[in-house]
Interface confidence: low
């Protein structure tokens, strides 16, 4: 597994790692994905000026990226473990189509993009094992996802670059919020 940033100090621990608890494993998995997103964002920002662009709103109209809201119960005020966990899983399931879109958007980081996608699938599985109320989790409609993917891929080059940047930024923010919330569970 990749080495999460700032983890070097843990490397000099006892010679045999103990099996990770469910929470540690989820925490570690999210940090792996965030590490991968950082690498992808680096390539995106080096390739275009999207990261400094003020025209994000133009592209954002085409996207319906998951975001944390007060009602989701993931913030410190009004924290609700069950509601929040449902939101995190639902959000990750919704992000999957956008991660699929990212698969052909990278040259030097193509493998990293696939790793982020696969790691997210595993994270969803971890969280589903943790969730008690799986019935409350809505799975995105495959037909809707397929047409969204087609629509995103049909955009002009500028919009595709902007979409890539926005997906990575939003996914990073969503995961960071999830990480904070999961540490309270």
């Amino acid at each position: 597994a990749p080495v999460p940033p700032g983890e070097d100090s843990k490397d000099v621990a006892a010679p045999h790692r103990q099996p990770l608890t469910s929470s540690e494993r989820i925490d570690k998995q999210i940090r792996y994905i965030l590490d991968g997103i950082s690498a992808l964002r680096k390539e995106t920002c080096n390739k275009s000026n999207m990261c400094e662009s003020s025209k994000e709103a133009l592209a954002e109209n085409n996207l319906n990226l998951p975001k944390m809201a007060e009602k989701d119960g993931c913030f410190q005020s009004g924290f609700n473990e069950e509601t929040c966990l449902v939101k995190i899983i639902t959000g990750l399931l919704e992000f999957e189509v956008y991660l699929e879109y990212l698969q052909n958007r990278f040259e030097s980081s193509e493998e990293q993009a696939r790793a982020v996608q696969m790691s997210t699938k595993v994270l969803i599985q971890f969280l589903q094992k943790k969730a008690k109320n799986l019935d409350a989790i809505t799975t995105p409609d495959p037909t809707t996802n397929a047409s969204l993917l087609t629509k995103l891929q049909a955009q002009n080059q500028w919009l595709q670059d902007m979409t890539t940047h926005l997906i990575l930024r939003s996914f990073k923010e969503f995961l960071q919020s999830s990480l904070r919330a999961l540490r309270q569970m």
Partner: antibody
């Protein structure tokens, strides 16, 4: 694409030491742990240990604690395994394998280095 | 942790369904992988985290399990599936492999 190129076959005498290499390409060497696995002819696979190339920290199957030393050279993206005090039991194919992004599974393997220990 | 893999040998015809099992000496959660090693080649990862197919692996290969008992299935064996199959636990170090199952095609 990801490739792990291992050094050629080795013939060594009992009691000697040998150092084999595994050159990584197609990915960021320091991001992924590198595992080493032993396979004796017609037998199963035995996990020896891994090294974190980013820090040099390694962890072993206790059985190989005094047998193997793992190192990594970040400048050449190469991992090394040294085996000492060789006996005929060490005759085997040794694989380096990159740790997968999503757990401690090995997703890319080198072609293997055959070690023959004989007097 | 000891991974006991059965059977050791399988002689099947193309088109058959094949099941290999691996029993862990203690719970390994779902931290199990399955590898395929064709003659003269290095092992290849097929299944990880108990049931996830690795990228590019045909969907005739599936994995399942319950913590200590794990099953690997090839729904319709093809001639190119001639290989040795290994399970591996990565729940805790030292990571251990099953003894392998040699699949031969009639």
């Amino acid at each position: 694409q990801v490739q792990l190129q291992q050094s050629g076959a080795e013939l060594a005498k009992p009691g000697a030491s040998v150092k084999m290499s595994c050159k990584a390409s197609g990915y960021t060497f320091t991001t992924y742990w590198m595992h080493w696995i032993k396979q004796r002819p017609g037998q199963g696979l035995e996990w020896i240990g891994y090294i974190n190339p980013s820090t040099g920290y390694s962890e072993f199957n206790q059985k190989f604690n005094d047998k193997a030393t793992l190192t990594a050279d970040r400048s050449s993206s190469t991992a090394y395994m040294q085996l000492n005090s060789l006996t005929s039991e060490d005759s085997a194919v040794y694989y380096c394998a990159r740790d997968a992004y999503y757990g401690n599974y090995e997703d890319y393997w080198g072609q293997g280095t055959t070690l023959t220990v004989s007097s | 942790i000891v991974m006991t893999q059965t059977p050791k040998f399988l002689l099947v015809s193309a088109g058959d369904r094949v099941t290999i099992t691996c029993k862990a000496s203690q719970s390994v959660s779902y931290d199990v992988a399955w590898y395929q090693q064709k003659p003269g080649q290095s092992p290849k990862l097929l299944i990880y985290y108990e049931s996830n197919r690795y990228s590019g692996v045909p969907d005739r290969f599936t994995g399942s399990g319950n913590g200590t008992d794990f099953t690997f299935t090839i729904s319709t064996v093809q001639a190119e599936d001639l290989a040795v199959y290994f399970c591996q636990q990565v729940y805790t170090s030292p990571y251990t492999f099953g003894g392998g199952t040699k699949l031969e095609i009639k």
